[in-house]
Amino acid sequence: VPQKPKVSLNPPWNRIFKGENVTLTCNGNNFFEVSSTKWFHNGSLSEETNSSLNIVNAKFEDSGEYKCQHQQVNESEPVYLEVFSDWLLLQASAEVVMEGQPLFLRCHGWRNWDVYKVIYYKDGEALKYWYENHNISITNATVEDSGTYYCTGKVWQLDYESEPLNITVIKAPREKYWLQ
């Protein structure tokens, strides 16, 4: 049975700044044919037929739902891309994480400007700080890591705060063992 394709992002962030670039790739097994991929953005068929969809110099209109389809195989699960204009943007490797999987958070500065005194917050409480910009890495996410995250930092000597981001950690499905 052909499996559903999956859309991946490179860089892996689904929240990006206006003007940045991101490549969406439609991954699946046994998809050999060139120009056989359909891309859907907010339900509309895109002109792109390659397995990779390049978004260059992202605009607000690039925000929304992306899905891909190989041949007549089922459509992929949707991936949501959001384009922002702000001083700081909290980016996450995923907004819904399976328990036991890694979670990475990044406090991204507009135009890649240096950000100092970066503090990450979870549910309103300071989680970690450092003098320069830094990432948060949770190697094995647990349900307790679910919450609302944001970051603060200094850009050009002024204090800024990112928009909050909800992270949900879901329990891994238990394998079913059937008695013979």
């Epitope: 503090i119 300071a126 989680l127 970690k128 700080y129 003098y131 930092g153």
Partner: antibody, heavy 120, light 111 residues
Amino acid sequence: EVQLVQSGAEVKKSGESLKISCKGFGYTFTRNWIGWVRQMPGKGLEWMGIIYPGDSDTRYSPSFQGQVTISADKSISTAYLQWSSLKASDTAMYYCARDVGNGDYGLDVWGQGTTVTVSS
Amino acid sequence: QSALTQPASVSGSPGQSITISCTGTSSDIGGYDFVSWYQQHPGKAPKLIIYDVTRRPSEISNRFSASKSGNTASLTISGLQAEDEADYYCSSYTSSSTPYVFGTGTKVTVL
């Protein structure tokens, strides 16, 4: 009152192991980095390393990397500095100190110091 | 990482002002607005007197002030008093892996 209380003076022989401690009081121990500083007799301050008790993220000075181990037990608000094999040159006063916090740069609360004497 | 350079000693009469310099490079003092200063009396633990280049903890006298220009940071003690006699150390951020490097230390003598 915010304070750091260090373990007592130690007299050891060369080649022995040692673990000294630094316990935090009066604040949320997991929310500030804790640094360790060496001061050899009659000499200046040397930064050894720093740990974030919240997740045990640790950074070492190149001069001390591989020579000592910094750790923390957040359940008892305590940071540690340990040696697996002491040398006579490890004879010094060792201080733990709390980072100001929130990305501000400085060490605002210091322990009273632990004197380590190593004889060869 | 080399220690920051401070004068070995500085002296002044009561009531005078003295300035202690702390010289680094563009990789430490010159590269970041992260400098702190410490006072250490004999047999005592160091005490923070300046953080973030110019900021003073609330309990520290306003006779202590600090600044930075290029690769050099400076600590000024005005209205020098007998209790200011101590060793003074600067510190600067150098990198994410080595956030603290101390100065060589300056002995302040009140004449």
